[in-house]
């Protein structure tokens, strides 16, 4: 059976039906994807340009595949099973009158059905299933997948993975504002900032006075203590953690299977035994890895280390002297942690703009 071999999928609404407001169409597809993400580990992100895994379009008649639409009634839509190119795409017959109510053809109900195909589900012979081949109106506000639908989609992707809750350990390490406090790794995780140190991490919402502390093992039993570098790709909900010659991927706060992997698979030379610090710059779509006196640059789009690296930190980051403990990307600046201090660095103008205590994030 066809299935996507990844958990994070993109979709794009290529064009819109004139029958409905654009924002209604956007909302309906968001909710239709949510129907499937609620019962699986799958996560969906909307693109506004470029090729997405699942391209959604409205069309009359012939529209670029062998499956011409037949005018009003009859075939309402069709979708392709998972795979590259046209595969995974969902096409809606523009000859229908698409609505968000019981009149015409309810877009939400047809979208849930077609996206089931886009995820690999076949038609069901159970009339209660959303994958039953015949359209019938159900109230979208009370719509629920049948047990059949849930069982079938979970046979492809498994059950949803609940993100663990961040709890406070019983004996938190003492004072933040200790003069010489340094961090092993610092990164954003969604709206929070995580400060890794030994076997625990502090986390806080910027601007909020509250600071929380959690042991690494209590939230991620498979992740070792002593994390040395970390970065987040927020648009994908991905967190990467590094220790020695290994790295781990945390998806939506859940460790991904088949990790750890070797850092050499990213393109590091054999001379690199550990990464001191890492930061992802979303504007450039690059990860900067700091290793002793040098830094490496990784292209996340191509999944390749950029050629001509490593380069000297001191040459390309004026005002920054090795060695670096941690780097945080926050509001278009890099915060470069070195011992008890951090440097606020503007990558656009390539200069240090502030020197702060490393604990300044905690109101120290």
């Amino acid at each position: 059976r066809s299935r996507w071999m990844k958990r994070y999928l993109t979709y794009r609404i290529y064009n819109y039906t004139p029958d409905m407001k654009r924002e209604d169409v956007d909302y309906i597809f968001q909710k239709a994807f949510q129907v499937w993400s609620d019962v699986t580990p799958l996560r969906f992100r909307k693109l506004h340009k470029d090729e997405a895994d699942i391209m959604i379009l409205f069309a009359f008649g012939a529209h670029g595949d062998f499956n011409y639409f037949d005018g009003k009634g009859g075939t309402l839509a069709h979708a392709f099973y998972p795979g590259p190119g046209i595969q995974g795409d969902a096409h809606f017959d523009e000859a229908e009158t698409w609505t968000k109510s019981f009149q015409g053809t309810n877009l939400f109900l047809v979208a849930v059905h077609e996206l089931g195909h886009s995820l690999g589900l076949q038609h069901s012979n159970n009339p209660k299933s959303i994958m039953y081949p015949t359209y019938r109106y159900l109230n979208p506000s009370t719509f629920r997948l049948s047990a059949d639908d849930i069982r079938n989609i979970q046979s492809l992707y498994g059950a949803p993975v609940k993100p663990p809750s961040l709890t406070k350990p019983s004996s938190p390490p003492s004072t933040f504002c200790h003069q010489s406090l340094s961090f092993d790794a610092v990164t954003t995780v969604g709206e929070k900032i995580f400060f890794f140190k030994d076997w625990f991490f502090w986390w806080k919402l910027p601007g909020s006075p509250a600071t929380n502390i959690t042991s690494i093992s209590s939230i991620w039993p498979s992740i070792p203590s002593g994390i040395q570098a970390a970065y987040e790709i927020e648009s994908r909900n991905q967190l990467f953690l590094f220790k020695d010659e290994k790295y781990w991927l945390i998806n939506n706060l859940v460790p991904e299977p088949h990790y750890p992997r070797s850092i050499y698979s990213l393109g590091f030379s054999a001379s690199v035994k550990k990464v001191d610090a890492a930061v992802f710059d979303p504007l450039r779509q690059k990860v900067y890895f700091f290793v002793d006196k040098h830094y490496w640059r990784y292209d996340v789009r191509q999944e390749l280390m950029d050629p001509a690296y490593p380069k000297l930190i001191s040459t390309h980051f004026p005002g920054i002297k090795p060695k670096i403990d941690a780097v945080l990307y926050f509001k278009r600046h890099y915060y470069i942690f070195q011992g008890a201090y951090q440097l606020e660095y503007d990558p656009l103008f390539r200069r240090v703009t502030k020197t702060l205590k490393s604990t300044s994030w905690f109101g120290c």
């Epitope: 066809s2 290529y14 090729e51 391209m55 379009l57 069309a59 012939a62 529209h63 670029g64 595949d65 062998f66 499956n67 069709h78 979708a79 392709f80 099973y81 795979g83 590259p84 190119g85 046209i86 595969q87 195909h117 076949q122």
Partner: antibody, heavy 122, light 103 residues
Framework: EVQLLESGGGLVQPGGSLRLSCAAS????????MSWVRQAPGKGLEWVSG????????FYADSVKGRFTISRDNSKNTLYLQMNSLRAEDTAVYYC???????????????WGRGTLVTVSS | DIQMTQSPSSLSASVGDRVTITCRAN??????LNWYQQKPGKAPELLIY???SLQSGVPSRFSGSGSGTDFTLTISSLQPEDFATYYC?????FGQGTKLEIK
């Protein structure tokens, strides 16, 4: 390694018949749409016919509709093209091509055979 | 019915040149356009699918772009092995081909 091997081509008189075969190997044949595409000598590519994984759905170019029949035998991993009432303009190299899997065909031909030459001449 | 018009029908160029071939549909085909390369006496090979996705194993000097009705295939730096005929295609419709010859 995906392989498609056409056979059954040859010289045939106008009005005659010919059956082409395409033996597939190196992939699971049954879930994929398959097509025949032809190329007249010195000319461009022309899609001829396509068939669904189960064989239940078939498509034909207008130029061959009613004369050609596409079929498949999934137990033998083989695609067929039965060509009747052949005309001089059917002279071409006939290629079989693998399409995508699933309920609908896209015409994304990622693997092709080497082709078999059909010559219709008196 | 959808028709595909490819231009130019033939093209002379030199090794190292940047070459662009265009394909136009008479109505929107969204991003459902594929490009194939065919060398004399050989079967066609898929280069680009879904307008811009490079087929596995195809050199990165080949790229595709476009959506709706207008599409292009670009070869950034011609290599000797790239002299061939190129076809655009969507579903059952092929363009008439562009023969790329050595200048």
């Amino acid at each position: 390694e995906v392989q498609l091997l056409e056979s059954g081509g040859g010289l045939v008189q106008p009005g005659g018949s010919l059956r082409l075969s395409c033996a597939a190997s190196g992939f699971t044949f049954s879930p994929y749409w398959m097509s025949w595409v032809r190329q007249a000598p010195g000319k461009g590519l022309e899609w001829v016919s396509g068939i669904s994984p189960s064989g239940g759905i078939t498509f034909y170019a207008d130029s061959v509709k009613g004369r050609f029949t596409i079929s498949r035998d999934n137990s033998k991993n083989t695609l067929y093209l039965q060509m009747n009432s052949l005309r001089a303009e059917d002279t071409a190299v006939y290629y079989c091509a693998k399409d995508i899997r699933g309920a609908y065909s896209s015409g994304l031909f990622d693997y092709w055979g080497r082709g078999t030459l059909v010559t219709v001449s008196s | 019915d959808i028709q595909m018009t490819q231009s130019p029908s033939s093209l002379s160029a030199s090794v190292g040149d940047r070459v662009t071939i265009t394909c136009r549909a008479n109505q929107s085909i969204y991003t459902y356009l594929n490009w194939y390369q065919q060398k004399p006496g050989k079967a066609p090979e898929l280069l680009i699918y879904a307008a811009s996705s490079l087929q596995s194993g195809v050199p990165s000097r080949f790229s595709g772009s476009g959506s709706g009705t207008d599409f292009t295939l670009t070869i950034s730096s011609l290599q000797p092995e790239d002299f061939a005929t190129y076809y655009c295609q969507q579903a059952g419709i092929f363009g008439q081909g562009t023969k790329l010859e050595i200048k």
